[in-house]
Interface confidence: low
């Protein structure tokens, strides 16, 4: 008799793929644009990335450090009108892209939460949640919650409002903290909260260190759904050298949870390569004319246009990984098992019931080395075969689809491999 199929878990929309943050509309659109109407014209691009949600803004009225002149119910006219926002929501829905609104109150000021008037601000947030839920948004983000006194209780209250409206609505909280205990204390009282933090921001050193960070986090959070990013708002290049960007894309897309990216992560956008551009929100490089005032600063391979035409580019890798992440059961909600491998390596398996299984091997080091996979670490339900098919490598030159002997697997410096193999009873 065939073994019984495992019952599928309940899947919310944010479980099915990546979220894409656009914190600065003007920098994202460039060319003197930067409003909601212009963003609507970029939704096809977001669709091509196969992302499931757009984390937008903040876009509300906020006069720096002035509570009275901060209105979470009003869109700053520089970004457009309520009608523009409604139109964006409708277009996004047609393309199956959910819209999450950032309501961090004092986003233009020194303290995001007006430290002296916490209760006033909390009331404003509550009113705003109800208003924007009625308007049709799919969720909310609040950042810098380490600056919010009694954050846990406020988040619990805001979560109740959000979930009370619909279980299909999401609340994201962001913190600059990288301390696991602080992160856990925020998560403790808030079931279903998606938390972005700087937890992984110092993970770039070695595979062993990354493995221990990831496994500690997953063990500590139990069976709750996680999100994966390197910070609550910043670009990957704020933390990583260029040679690790592909490796991290592969990792973020294949860990159990929701990967969260900032605009530009898909092309390796880096402020230091763009004279005069701010670290937190450099102008998005759509093509070579996106940064017109400094001739020669931008080459084609730094842009969306250039990378779209190159199957070996970071953007092409992002699109492929995003596509795999959104359609393979083992990557959508499969079990995760990390296991030992050679020095500088992080390797793990993702599997769900009788579906196709995935092996990820990441070489964080700058030397090529044999994988030396220790399958003895794995439970019987997740055993490794002798061979697995290469789905993709982060480096050019390997023949995709070819079976690789796991015993003899060797990785190039900074190479990541995604391999697939069938379930075997």
């Amino acid at each position: 008799r065939a073994p019984r199929c495992r019952e599928l878990p309940a899947q919310k929309w944010w479980h099915t793929g990546a979220l894409y943050r656009i914190g600065d509309l003007q920098a994202f659109q460039g060319h003197g644009a930067g409003n909601l109407a212009g963003l609507k014209g970029r939704l096809d691009y977001l669709s091509s990335l196969k992302v499931k949600g757009l984390v937008l803004g903040p876009i509300h009225k906020n006069q720096k450090d002035d509570v009275a002149q901060t209105d979470l119910l009003q869109i700053d006219p520089n970004f457009g009108s309520k009608e523009d926002f409604d139109s964006l929501l409708q277009s996004a829905k047609k393309k199956s892209i959910r819209v999450i609104l950032d309501l961090t109150p004092n986003y233009r000021g020194e303290n995001s939460w007006f430290s002296t008037q916490v209760d006033t601000v909390a009331t404003k947030v509550k009113d705003a949640l109800e208003f924007w839920l009625q308007a049709g948004v799919d969720g909310f983000q609040v950042r810098d919650i380490e600056n919010l006194k009694d954050a846990s209780s406020f988040l619990a209250e805001w979560q109740n409002i959000t979930k009370g409206f619909s279980e299909d609505r999401l609340l994201i909280a962001g913190t600059n903290s990288s301390d696991l205990q602080q992160i856990l204390s925020l998560l403790e009282s808030n079931k279903d909260l998606l938390l972005t933090s700087s937890y992984l921001s110092d993970s770039g050193s070695t595979g062993e260190h990354t493995k221990s960070l990831v496994t500690q986090y997953l063990n500590a959070t139990g069976n709750r759904w996680c999100s994966w990013s390197l910070s609550q708002a910043r670009l990957l290049t704020s933390f990583l050298p260029a040679q690790l960007l592909r490796l991290y894309q592969l990792m973020l897309f294949t860990l159990p949870g929701t990967p969260v990216f900032s605009y530009g992560d898909e092309i390796g956008l880096d402020a230091a390569a763009l004279p005069g551009q701010p670290m937190e929100a450099p102008v998005m490089l759509w093509d070579e004319s996106s940064f017109p005032d400094i001739p020669g600063a931008v080459s084609a391979n730094m842009t969306v246009k250039g990378q779209s035409e190159d199957p070996g580019s970071l953007l092409s890798l992002f699109r492929r990984l995003s596509d795999q992440r959104s359609k393979e059961r083992s990557l959508l909600h499969g079990d995760f098992h990390a296991f030992s491998a050679g020095p500088g390596l992080f390797s793990y398996i993702r599997h769900w019931d009788q579906n196709e299984r995935f092996l990820v091997v990441l070489n964080f080091g700058d030397v090529g080395l044999s994988a030396g996979l220790q399958a003895s670490d794995l439970p019987a339900s997740a055993s490794l075969p002798a061979k697995a098919d290469l789905l993709l490598s982060t480096q050019p030159g390997r023949e995709e689809g070819s079976p690789l002997e796991l015993e003899r697997l060797k990785l190039e410096p900074h190479e990541g491999l995604l391999l697939r193999f069938p379930y075997a009873a």
Epitope: Q26, A27, G30, H31, G32, A33, G34, N176, S198, S201, R234, T237, S238, F239, L240, P241, A242, D270, A271, A272, A273, P275, G276, Q277, P278, M279, E280, V283, P292, D293, I294, A297
Partner: antibody
């Protein structure tokens, strides 16, 4: 808020090298670009180069290419600038600065004296 | 490279009087896509590192007294000290942060008359 503390004054012989350090504390090291600026005695300010400590990407003033090498170590939140083939005209105070674009935070400066 | 020219080289002003320093760029510092001027002003006292006063040509850094103000757009910029105090004696520099290499003006020394 970020505090930048630089290494102490150095006296060097012509032709030698010197490595000046700049240790950041306070805010996250990777939140800032680290810039290096020099000021010769009685002179104005001259921008030398910049590093993004997160990605390691650098940009140099043409004038200092081959003369200065800027690096950063995220694990110790420290940026470095090494000057090679020192000459008497390299005698100056060297400042590191934490910036987004403008130079918001400055180290106290390191005086490098090149003298035979 | 873009050249930043400051004038005058030095300036002697009575306490309580207005001091005005000019800075001219050989190329526009106004960036079309965000309509911001990529210019900053610094104050440097003897034996100290420079201190940021103004960025985006007219935004005062936190903690900077409101007697300091910046104005101008494109290629011509001004730093004004509306009522000179004894502690304002220093050298003032403008700096462009638009396109590498960043460049500074030659500096203006402000003294008390």
């Amino acid at each position: 808020q970020v505090q930048l503390v630089q290494s102490g004054a150095e006296v060097k012989k012509p032709g030698s090298s010197v490595k000046v350090s700049c240790k950041a504390s306070g805010n996250a090291f990777t939140n800032y670009l680290i810039e290096w600026v020099r000021q010769a005695p009685g002179q104005g300010l001259e921008w030398m180069g910049v590093i993004n400590p997160g990605s390691g990407i650098t940009n140099y003033n043409e004038k200092f290419k081959g003369k200065a090498t800027i690096t950063a170590d995220k694990s110790t939140s420290t940026a470095y600038m090494e000057l090679s083939s020192l000459r008497s005209e390299d005698t100056a105070v060297y400042y590191c600065s934490g910036s987004a674009n403008w130079f918001a935070y400055w180290g106290q400066g390191t005086l490098v004296t090149v003298s035979s | 490279d873009i050249v930043m020219t400051q004038s005058p080289d030095s300036l002697a002003v009575s306490l309580g009087e207005r001091a005005t320093i000019n800075c001219k760029s050989s190329q526009s510092l106004l960036y079309s896509s965000n309509q911001k001027n990529y210019l900053a002003w610094y104050q440097q006292k003897p034996g100290q590192p420079p201190k940021l006063l103004i960025y985006w040509a007219s935004t005062r850094d936190s903690g900077v007294p409101d007697r300091f103000s910046g104005s101008g757009s494109g290629t011509d910029f001004t730093l004004t000290i509306s009522s000179l105090q004894a502690e304002d004696v220093a050298v003032y520099y403008c700096q462009r942060y638009y396109g590498y290499p960043w460049t500074f003006g030659g500096g203006t020394k402000v003294e008390i008359k």
